[in-house]
Interface confidence: low
Amino acid sequence: RGVFRRDAHKSEVAHRFKDLGEENFKALVLIAFAQYLQQCPFEDHVKLVNEVTEFAKTCVADESAENCDKSLHTLFGDKLCTVATLRETYGEMADCCAKQEPERNECFLQHKDDNPNLPRLVRPEVDVMCTAFHDNEETFLKKYLYEIARRHPYFYAPELLFFAKRYKAAFTECCQAADKAACLLPKLDELRDEGKASSAKQRLKCASLQKFGERAFKAWAVARLSQRFPKAEFAEVSKLVTDLTKVHTECCHGDLLECADDRADLAKYICENQDSISSKLKECCEKPLLEKSHCIAEVENDEMPADLPSLAADFVESKDVCKNYAEAKDVFLGMFLYEYARRHPDYSVVLLLRLAKTYETTLEKCCAAADPHECYAKVFDEFKPLVEEPQNLIKQNCELFEQLGEYKFQNALLVRYTKKVPQVSTPTLVEVSRNLGKVGSKCCKHPEAKRMPCAEDYLSVVLNQLCVLHEKTPVSDRVTKCCTESLVNRRPCFSALEVDETYVPKEFNAETFTFHADICTLSEKERQIKKQTALVELVKHKPKATKEQLKAVMDDFAAFVEKCCKADDKETCFAEEGKKLVAASQAALGL
């Protein structure tokens, strides 16, 4: 029943153009190009996309026309390599163009930058945006795709089309409203926050495929889809996993046209077969394509079948466990994961994968023993501490969150993580700890049965951000170790890290703690980031500082900012009071 088995096409570019339509074709090519050449100006990309589109149209008209039989990688790579400033702008990435396909594409992929040196996107005034939208809607929306894609080179391309559709809808509605700003700004904030979350989730999928292989991704998908579709048969889940793996492998590999096309096919298949998949898909399947695919990806878990037998019968008590395992190891482990996951929507996916790994390790050992059954009889007892560890951690941290509130909870995590891995750059520590801290508002409100899947799977996404940023400029062996040893044990690995006793404290630099009147005009969020940056620097100077010492200094700092922002001569206040604050902080921390 393979969805993706298609007849061979004479011209791949014509095939994708016809399947996707001109609008989606152009949008996806623009995303692909912007994700590869992240520094190129918008106008250059638009020109390249238009040239590719014109070429595709000639191939639709005549599939046997010259070059129409070339692979998409060859066509797109050749086009990217025509950029005149490649060497000056991208340095060694230009060497990719000396290679042949498929390694030229591999080379481009390896030069994708998770943290490109691009200016922060500043939102113009609402009237300015509405004028630009009305003047040239098409260019306005292309600019959105371009700006998001170049800043998020692994953004899930078909999902970015869905975001662009919502972005357009927001402007269409709000630019006609009486109070444009009140209508538009909350929608843009929501899109921005959802977009960042979507980008980070997709980045984890790509890291899983690229760093740990297809088997790791498939295991994740079996667990997640079994939780979501507990009434589906194992064969059905396996088929969905195979197809989903193909879609994500394509998108992570830069094959965005194939990815979008195959995702549409997968949505179509799921909707045609909802009776054997899930009772929760009806509403999703009535929506247009982009909304449909998004809705399916976010659909709530179906109810568990009422009469599921005990797992022990097939996976512990049966005399055939080793025989079944030996015959087809991955299939047997897949069935174990499926059966366990569909019974446990209350577990995180990473916990389910840890349990499956423990089960696999036990069978590897026991099936070679004199009495295999005796050896693996107590395997389920080994699961208890694995289940309790995240439960206890979430309970403690939700209590702390409820006691402190989000900002102070983030600060507690900033201190905790800076002490664990003080070599990591301050902006990265601030960004990651702020995101780790958001787990409180996101997950602690949920009942017990939903807390762990929410919290631990979200933490996996955030810690992957740390891993990909650290990989670009590695500075800590401990981070490298936690990031590379095991995908499913990253969070426990980071949780287990103690204060780094080998760290030599940073030299004190008063400049780091010098503030100016511009802080007064910042938004509350940006002001928090300034204060949290100072907190990380304090911990790097004085890693042995106690919570109480750090709290006292941060309270003084908050009072200092508040006082000077109310002063008539703000700049003088920041200069004079700032010196006093630095001196007092040094004394308080014994610097």
């Epitope: 390896q110 760093k211 297809e214």
Partner: nanobody
Framework: QVQLVESGGGLVQAGGSLRLSCTAS????????MAWYRQAPGQQREFVAR???????NYPDSVKGRFTISRDNAKNTVYLQMNSLKPEDTAVYYC?????????WGQGTQVTVSS
């Protein structure tokens, strides 16, 4: 991590044959594709052959019909059978592997084709 060790290089007359082997160890379950590359002195590293987990292969025109890549999954080994060797095939041959693209590399084995 994945470790790759090449063997089988050496000196051979033009028109002769050689068979290179590359054995993988470590986290080999993550490996979906393996390949051979080569680098002649002062030249760019160049792609020679690739094989996917499913067994599909591809080659550049310069070696097509002369070189064959194959793999023995049981031995975690990939082979490169090189026939009708030419002096311009002289290079250090590297084995490479990875889950989605080649990110792990061997140390290389020297192949010299004399005329």
């Amino acid at each position: 991590q994945v470790q790759l060790v090449e063997s089988g290089g050496g000196l051979v007359q033009a028109g002769g044959s050689l068979r290179l082997s590359c054995t993988a160890s470590g986290s080999i379950e993550s490996i979906n594709r393996m390949a051979w590359y080569r680098q002649a002195p002062g030249q760019q590293r160049e792609f020679v052959a690739r094989i996917s987990k499913g067994g599909s292969t591809n080659y550049p025109d310069s070696v097509k019909g002369r070189f064959t890549i194959s793999r023995d999954n049981a031995k975690n080994t990939v082979y490169l059978q090189m026939n009708s060797l030419k002096p311009e095939d002289t290079a250090v041959y590297y084995c490479a592997a990875g889950p989605v693209w080649e990110q792990f590399w061997g140390q290389g084995t020297q192949v010299t084709v004399s005329s």
